[in-house]
């Protein structure tokens, strides 16, 4: 087959304006705004939070994922694109799935808040694909994974009675097992032909570096938005600040000790930051005292750096997942270390009280993550056989990674 | 003292509107969600609705959704709720009462319960032609 | 839709004794229940929270026990202030909802 880049130009314009032609309709039809006057204070107190994630979505993971060398523009621009697209459609599903029986969707700013960590569950499935795929395949993706984590948020719910801060904090392990299942199912990189385009480069790699930056600075906002009262966002807040505070430390430190001449990996530090806010995202308002934060945060950081250096290789034969992506792999095992730490210290306290349930409460919490990577696998491979059929124009394995297969360059420098 | 105060009531024909205020005193109210419980004469409490302590959140009973809205002015201490289309079967004294998030303290985790701590005295409504 | 059951409708105990009510869901609401006294013409007053923590105020006569779907409300040595109506109340994560059982009203024997 032809090694010239296939024109997505019938196929993306059409796709995405009729996606959100339908996506007007459903919000003329089916939705309103709240209509009560609240507190000024109060609405911009509760706007920064969804500000905040919004910065994180677009600015923090969008850069965090431009680190390589001929692939950085697509990285950013199609990031917002699917954040864009999964905020309107998360909007519409989860108002669907909680709300529709009374007739219309009410659109709050909590309605947003949500929405928009929906959307970002994509943005870090996505870290496995970019740059194998176009943005009409995206666009699926989007619409897939948005609607299998809407749905998985529910039943889990429905089932195991947890709320919104509990079951939306699968999102680290559902992301990242669905964006690999996905990368499983596309075609390898040509070995020959991608060499010189998934290696990082320096001002590409300071923007990932300053993707991280944004990521770590907001992830306590993350890590309590959905929370229901002060006290729990307080706790949040303040624990994620230590476990992302130390694994920074452990990361840099980590970095250094793994290499032979004691140099620091920017690959590491762009993901290991970050480890602690992920580790402790679901028992972040449960957890009682900074030290316990900032061990977490220790392990997350040895964790992820140890990741980083064993398991790209591994990866990258098995997934066709460049050396540089390393999100999926680390928010896996993140992901399930934050897990791990739930039950933990569910059973270390059940126990210490005594009560007979601990048993009970053990296996609901194994049956929660055990239904997320299943959805997650599951959904993701549905995903990865879709973008697979020929209707999408998928650009050739030759032409992985590479800006130039849906930009305008006005001048093509040589090292672009 | 912590205190919560429901005014508004009175008789109103059906298909009309009424709005019901709460004013909180004694406690940081910015602090805390808010509900709205109602018990019809010679019948049991239903509850009506719940705001989130910053305004971000509502949830409603099936029986009102649609037709009333709760909220908030933290600036003013008042929680508010706007009751449209009302119904005979809307009848009730109608209670506002501040949701209790309480943190219990375990050896290696934190333990939030929720409750209805403090209610105020009611407000009659009668929805009558 | 979470249906709370009390029961018994109507419990008659005489004072001093020990009375036992219950409360029963339709499915598992965890631990997120709580107990609250009503006297006629007052406001609801809230016992336990958590299943079986006494809010603050309350004696040490009242206890709260259970957890999933079956829960119980024991008064260990009834006085005289004791008698009037008790709900038990759910607290769904997922949509937000609150049901209030029926309510069982405690009458002097």
């Known amino acids: 087959s032809s090694k010239y880049p296939r024109s997505v130009r019938r196929c993306l314009p059409l796709w995405a304006l009729t996606l959100e032609a339908a996506l007007i309709l459903l919000f003329y039809f089916f939705t309103h705004y709240d209509a009560s006057l609240e507190d000024q204070k109060g609405l911009v107190a509760s706007y920064q939070v969804g500000q905040d994630l919004t910065v994180m979505a677009a600015i923090g993971l969008g850069f965090l994922t431009s680190s390589f060398r001929r692939h950085s523009w697509s990285s950013v621009a199609f990031n917002l694109f699917m954040l864009a697209l999964g905020v309107q459609w998360a909007i519409l599903l989860d108002g669907f799935l909680s709300q529709f029986p009374s007739g219309k969707v009410v659109i709050t700013l909590f309605s947003i808040r949500l929405a928009t960590m929906s959307a970002l569950s994509v943005l870090i499935s996505v870290d496995a694909v970019l740059g194998k795929v176009n943005l009409a395949q995206l666009v699926v993706m989007v619409l897939v994974e948005v609607t299998a984590l809407g749905n998985l948020r529910m039943v889990i719910s429905n089932i195991f009675n947890t709320d919104y801060h509990m079951n939306m904090m699968h999102i680290y392990v559902f992301a990242a097992y669905f964006g690999l299942s996905v990368a499983w199912c596309l075609p390898k990189p040509l070995p020959e032909g991608t060499e010189d385009k998934d290696q990082t480069a320096t001002i590409p790699s300071l923007s990932a570096m300053l993707g991280a930056l944004f990521l770590w600075m907001f992830w306590p906002s993350f890590n309590s938005a959905l929370l229901r009262s002060p006290i729990e966002r307080k706790n949040a807040v303040f624990n994620t600040y230590y476990a992302v505070a130390v694994s920074v430390v452990t990361a840099i430190s980590g970095s250094s000790l793994a290499h032979p001449q004691g140099k620091i990996s920017k690959t590491y530090v762009h993901s290991a930051v970050l480890a602690g806010g992920v580790a402790v995202g679901t028992s972040c308002h449960l957890i009682p005292s900074p030290w316990l934060a900032m061990v977490l945060g220790l392990v997350a950081g040895l964790i992820s750096v140890g990741g980083a250096k064993y398991l790209p290789g591994c990866c990258n034969r098995v997934l066709g997942i460049p050396h540089s992506s390393i999100m999926g792999y680390n928010f896996s095992l993140l992901g399930l270390l934050g897990e791990i730490i739930y039950i933990v210290l569910l059973v270390l306290d059940t126990v210490g009280a005594g009560n007979g349930m601990i048993g009970f409460q053990v296996l609901l919490s194994i049956g929660e993550l055990s239904l997320a990577i299943v959805i997650a696998l599951m959904s993701g491979l549905l995903t990865g056989l879709l973008l697979n059929l020929k209707i999408w124009k998928a650009p050739h394995e030759a032409k992985y990674f590479d800006d130039q297969v849906f930009w305008k360059f006005p001048h093509l420098a040589v090292g672009f | 003292q912590v205190q919560l105060v429901e005014s508004g009531g009175g008789v109103v024909q059906p298909g009309r509107s009424l709005r019901l205020s709460c004013a909180a005193s004694?406690?940081?109210?910015?602090?805390?969600?808010m509900h709205w419980v109602r018990q019809a004469p010679g019948k049991g409490l239903e509850w009506v609705a719940v705001?989130?302590?910053?305004?971000?959140?509502?949830y409603y009973a099936d029986s009102v959704k649609g037709r009333f809205t709760i909220s908030r002015d933290n600036s003013k201490n008042t929680l508010y709720l706007q009751m449209n289309s009302l119904r005979a079967e809307d009848t009730a004294v109608y209670y506002c009462?501040?949701?209790?998030?309480?943190?219990?303290?375990?050896?290696?985790?934190?333990?939030?319960?929720?409750?209805?701590?403090?209610w105020g005295k009611g407000t009659t409504v009668t929805v009558s032609s | 839709e979470i249906v709370m059951t009390q029961s018994p409708a109507t419990l008659s105990v005489s004072p001093g004794e020990r009375a036992t009510l219950s409360c029963r869901a339709s499915q598992s609401v965890s631990s997120n229940l709580a107990w609250y006294q009503q006297k006629p013409g007052q406001a609801p007053r809230l016992l336990i929270y958590g299943a079986s923590t006494r809010a603050t105020g309350i004696p040490a006569r009242f206890s709260g026990s259970g957890s999933g779907t079956e829960f119980t409300l024991t008064i260990s040595s009834l006085q005289s202030e004791d008698f009037a109506v008790y709900y038990c109340?759910?607290?769904?994560?997922?949509?937000?909802?609150?049901?209030f059982g029926q309510g069982t009203k405690l009458e002097i024997k």
């Open positions: 009462a501040r949701d209790m998030v309480t943190m219990v303290r375990g050896a290696y985790r934190n333990y939030y319960y929720y409750g209805m701590d403090v």
């Open positions: 109340q759910q607290y769904n994560n997922w949509p937000t909802l609150y049901t």
């Open positions: 004694g406690f940081t109210f910015s602090s805390y969600g």
């Open positions: 705001i989130w302590y910053d305004g971000s959140n509502k």
